[in-house]
């Protein structure tokens, strides 16, 4: 599907001192979506402001979000889902900035859960797998996912691939023997809806085998 | 009150090209994307691609690649619509037209008719 | 490409009648409640103008004799009591896949 900013990509910063981000949640809680927005300037004193929405919502013209502690948010079966909202940051009734955006446009999955990874030593493969919450959801029911792995000594040196579904193999002969592997993953929108990457999930930590010296393969642990 | 003025009628000979116009007015030209709908002469409509002002960023019909180029002026609130070796079966009227969300279009230009005639 | 088809090609009805135009869709263009399915009128010389969005929302400005309805691959256009200034072709669109498609129109006349 054609789009216009790249998936991940946060609206523009506005030009001025209140510029926000946003992202959007659907049925994040039973048949409730949620909106989150936020200052991008930690600095900002947010002590008087508030947040509006208006536009493409069933039944009311507009909504006030809730403030908890920095960030700002919405619980509520009432968004349209098509049509640009008007999201701005007041002071009592006067408007200091606002943006028009398509609430299907910055959706934020949910992150992935329960991955694991499982040695097949017969097959000298790695199995691994994970669930998400979006396999019984209505909307965003298609992602991808970004699995990354690295040898637990190698600070930054990530591997990622990206997968469809929830199952992803690993050679043996990929990974360095009788080594310990963090693995995590995290997910993106990716039919219709755009957005950005879900938070990662908890890690997941593996050893591979020794290598056996008489058949030069890795023993199991 | 919102708006979409497109330049005038065209004709120009196969093998040109012919650049359309259309400016925006009465709202924040950076809020919506803006796209382009040809009509052939007693035909229906088509969709040829649009563009997002905020960012320059393109989307085209599979159809018009390579034929179209989209392309927007934030200071003057217009967006052009480029199309390159013309020939007889590009005559039509050509509409810009605002998205009001993902992709419906609730403002249309008047129409540009291009007429492509050796 | 979601092929569009529109049915009837054209429509002649009385003055205070009811006019059902539908559209069928080669493959659903609904996402749960979601129906990415929109109606245009044109008349003679003009630019389409949009009357519903999402399937069953009015756009602002339209008399509310117009309606949609429908889910997935089949919906309905319905001009409850047809007036003489609702003479137009009508389209429908789809916005779930690029590209955006568009029915083959449907022709309101007065009988």
């Known amino acids: 599907e054609s789009g216009y900013a790249q998936n991940g990509d946060l609206e523009d910063a506005e030009l001025d001192d209140y510029s926000f981000s946003c992202y959007s949640q659907l049925e994040v809680n039973g048949s409730q979506h949620s909106l989150t927005c936020a200052f991008e300037d930690p600095d900002v004193n947010i002590t008087n402001l508030e947040f509006e929405i208006c536009g493409a919502l069933v039944e009311v013209k507009c909504l006030n979000f809730r403030k908890l502690q920095e960030i700002y948010f919405i619980e509520t079966k009432k968004f349209l889902l098509i049509g640009k909202s008007n999201i701005c940051v007041k002071v009592g009734e006067k408007s200091l900035t606002c943006k028009k955006i398509d609430l299907t446009t910055i959706v934020k999955p949910e992150a992935p859960f329960d991955l694991s990874v499982v040695y097949r030593e017969g097959a000298n493969d790695f199995v691994v797998t994970f669930n998400t919450s979006h396999l019984q959801k209505k909307y965003v029911k298609v992602l991808m996912h970004d699995v990354a792995y690295r040898q637990e000594k190698d600070e930054n040196k990530w591997t990622h691939v990206n997968l469809s579904s929830t199952k992803l193999t690993l050679l043996q002969r990929k990974l360095q023997p009788a080594a310990m592997y963090e693995i995590k993953v995290r997910s993106i929108p990716d039919h219709y809806f755009k957005g950005f990457w879900s938070e990662w999930s908890p890690s997941y930590y593996f050893r591979t085998p020794e290598i056996n010296n008489s058949s030069g393969e890795m023993d199991p642990i | 009150q919102v708006q979409l003025v497109q330049s005038g009628a065209e004709v120009k000979k196969p093998g040109a090209s012919v650049k359309v116009s259309c400016k925006a007015s009465g709202y924040r030209f950076t809020d919506y994307e803006l796209h382009w709908v040809r009509q052939a002469p007693g035909q229906g409509l088509e969709w040829m691609g649009g563009?997002?002002?905020?960012?320059?960023?393109?989307a085209y019909n599979q159809k018009f690649k390579g034929k179209v180029t989209l392309t927007s002026d934030r200071s003057t609130s217009t967006v052009y619509m480029e199309l390159s070796s013309l020939r007889s079966e590009d005559t039509a009227v050509y509409y810009c037209a605002r998205s009001g969300g993902r992709w419906y279009f609730d403002v249309w230009g008047q129409g540009t008719t291009v007429t492509v005639s050796s | 490409d979601i092929v569009m088809t529109q049915s009837p090609d054209s429509l002649a009805v009385s003055l205070g009648e009811r006019a059902t135009i539908n559209c069928r869709t080669s493959?659903?263009?609904?996402?749960?409640?979601?129906?990415?399915m929109h109606w245009y009128q044109q008349k003679p010389g003009q630019p389409p103008k949009l009357l519903i969005y999402g399937a069953s929302n009015l756009e602002s400005g339209v008399p509310d004799r117009f309606s949609g309805s429908g889910s997935g691959t089949d919906f309905t256009l319905t001009i409850s009591s047809l007036q003489a200034e609702d003479v137009a072709v009508y389209y429908c669109q789809q916005s779930i896949k690029d590209p955006y498609t568009f029915g083959g129109g449907t022709k309101v006349e007065i009988k």
């Open positions: 493959e659903s263009v609904s996402i749960h409640l979601l129906h990415l």
């Open positions: 563009i997002d002002p905020k960012t320059g960023g393109t």
